[in-house]
């Protein structure tokens, strides 16, 4: 698994480098998670033909995965820093149950799946420090999450593979949108 941001030997070997700003740290953290997702997607796509599934087929799912919409203020048109930041944090918190589901779904990339999950927790902490209006952030209900997890794990094998593929694809898209928005802040 790749070394998490801020822990690679090059940082230690270069004492004169300027410490990363909060924004740079967040940017680096997101890119690190995206690398992890790419590795997981590679295993998923090699194992089955899920990656060839049409967008239409994937759209008809029972999941409620976070997605960026115009009203969230993260797009260039109608950009709103505070609203957008709340959406990013809320979305990441909602993704956590799906990242938990991904654990034990990979044979050769088990560590990678754990790294994505842990790095996302760190990213949430970074963003929460940046956010002023923490009251607007709703945390998912643990009981609801627990029953959702049970339901996802009860699916037949093909559905579980399809769900894994969809979670990775949606999480990647959400992080890419977040990265673009955060670069405007």
């Amino acid at each position: 698994a790749p070394v998490p941001p801020g822990e690679d030997s090059k940082d230690v070997a270069a004492p004169h480098r300027q410490p990363l700003t909060s924004s740079e740290r967040i940017d680096k953290q997101i890119r690190y998670i995206l690398d992890g997702i790419s590795a997981l997607r590679k295993e998923t796509c090699n194992k089955s033909n899920m990656c060839e599934s049409s967008k239409e087929a994937l759209a008809e799912n029972n999941l409620n995965l976070p997605k960026m919409a115009e009203k969230d203020g993260c797009f260039q048109s109608g950009f709103n820093e505070e609203t957008c930041l709340v959406k990013i944090i809320t979305g990441l918190l909602e993704f956590e149950v799906y990242l938990e589901y991904l654990q034990n779904r990979f044979e050769s990339s088990e560590e990678q799946a754990r790294a994505v999950q842990m790095s996302t927790k760190v990213l949430i902490q970074f963003l929460q420090k940046k956010a002023k209006n923490l009251d607007a952030i709703t945390t998912p209900d643990p009981t609801t999450n627990a029953s959702l997890l049970t339901k996802l794990q009860a699916q037949n094998q093909w559905l579980q593979d399809m769900t894994t593929h969809l979670i990775l694809r949606s999480f990647k898209e959400f992080l890419q949108s977040s990265l673009r928005a955060l670069r405007q802040m």
């Epitope: 599934s53 239409e56 087929a57 994937l58 008809e60 799912n61 029972n62 339901k151 009860a154 699916q155 037949n156 094998q157 093909w158 559905l159 399809m162």
Partner: antibody, heavy 120, light 111 residues
Framework: EVQLQQSGAKLVKPGASVKLSCTAS????????MHWVKQRPEQGLEWIGR????????KYDPKFQGKATITADTSSNTAYLQLSSLTSEDTAVYYC?????????????WGAGTTVTVSS | DIVLTQSPASLAVSLGQRATISCRAS??????????MNWFQQKPGQPPKLLIY???NQGSGVPARFSGSGSGTDFSLNIHPMEEDDTAMYFC?????????FGGGTKLEIK
């Protein structure tokens, strides 16, 4: 021709164990999931569990956990169902069935069934 | 577990007429545009035989008089025209979740 050949009828005493076999021909069990289903006289069908012979991963209905053990021997292309601590409630016909991985999820080939009678 | 309720428990239909068997699931068995509902026919002393998979797809070698429909929680199996050979027990089965579950069965006879 794709077939599942099951072992013959068994008459066993209460408290004993029994091991049923299901031998596949016309396909490799490693490419499928092998399931076991119970049917009591004049009753419905109950799923017991399944094995993925490629990695010996098993799943059971909680009500058969501890009662049933599913195994597979890929060299003989055979799946097994072992039932322990038998009681009259275990008197039934036991079917093995094949399930192929894919978009649709169904039992397409069934064995003829093995009748297990528990009696002293 | 997903509970499947079949109705009626028994049915008598005249030769050449239509037989309709219903199956209701305790929750939706749909996902990704697929209905994970299958139908089986079972004759005395024989194993179940696949008739319909994915709610409406015919199993291999199944006569065209057998058809399935429905989505979500409500499904039905239609047999038309009814033939002598169709006297049997019919079961619905969901494969969306583990454990896969079966309906209680419908006994179809000739009137």
């Amino acid at each position: 021709e794709v077939q599942l050949q099951q072992s013959g009828a068994k008459l066993v005493k209460p408290g004993a164990s029994v091991k049923l076999s299901c031998t596949a021909s016309g396909f490799n069990i490693k490419d499928t999931y092998m399931h076991w289903v119970k049917q009591r006289p004049e009753q419905g069908l109950e799923w017991i569990g399944r094995i993925d012979p490629a990695n010996v991963n098993t799943k059971y209905d909680p009500k058969f956990q501890g009662k049933a053990t599913i195994t597979a021997d890929t060299s003989s292309n055979t799946a097994y169902l072992q039932l322990s601590s038998l009681t009259s409630e275990d008197t039934a016909v036991y079917y093995c069935a094949r399930l192929l991985y894919g978009r649709y999820w169904y039992f397409d080939v069934w064995g003829a069934g093995t009748t297990v009678t528990v009696s002293s | 577990d997903i509970v499947l309720t079949q109705s009626p428990a028994s049915l008598a239909v005249s030769l050449g007429q239509r037989a309709t068997i219903s199956c209701r699931a305790s929750e939706s068995v749909d996902n990704y545009g697929i209905s994970f509902m299958n139908w089986f026919q079972q004759k005395p002393g024989q194993p179940p035989k696949l008739l319909i998979y994915g709610a409406s797809n015919q199993g291999s070698g199944v006569p065209a008089r057998f058809s399935g429909s429905g989505s979500g929680t409500d499904f039905s199996l239609n047999i038309h025209p009814m033939e002598e050979d169709d006297t049997a027990m019919y079961f619905c089965q969901q494969s969306k979740e583990v454990p896969p579950t079966f309906g209680g069965g419908t006994k179809l006879e000739i009137k």
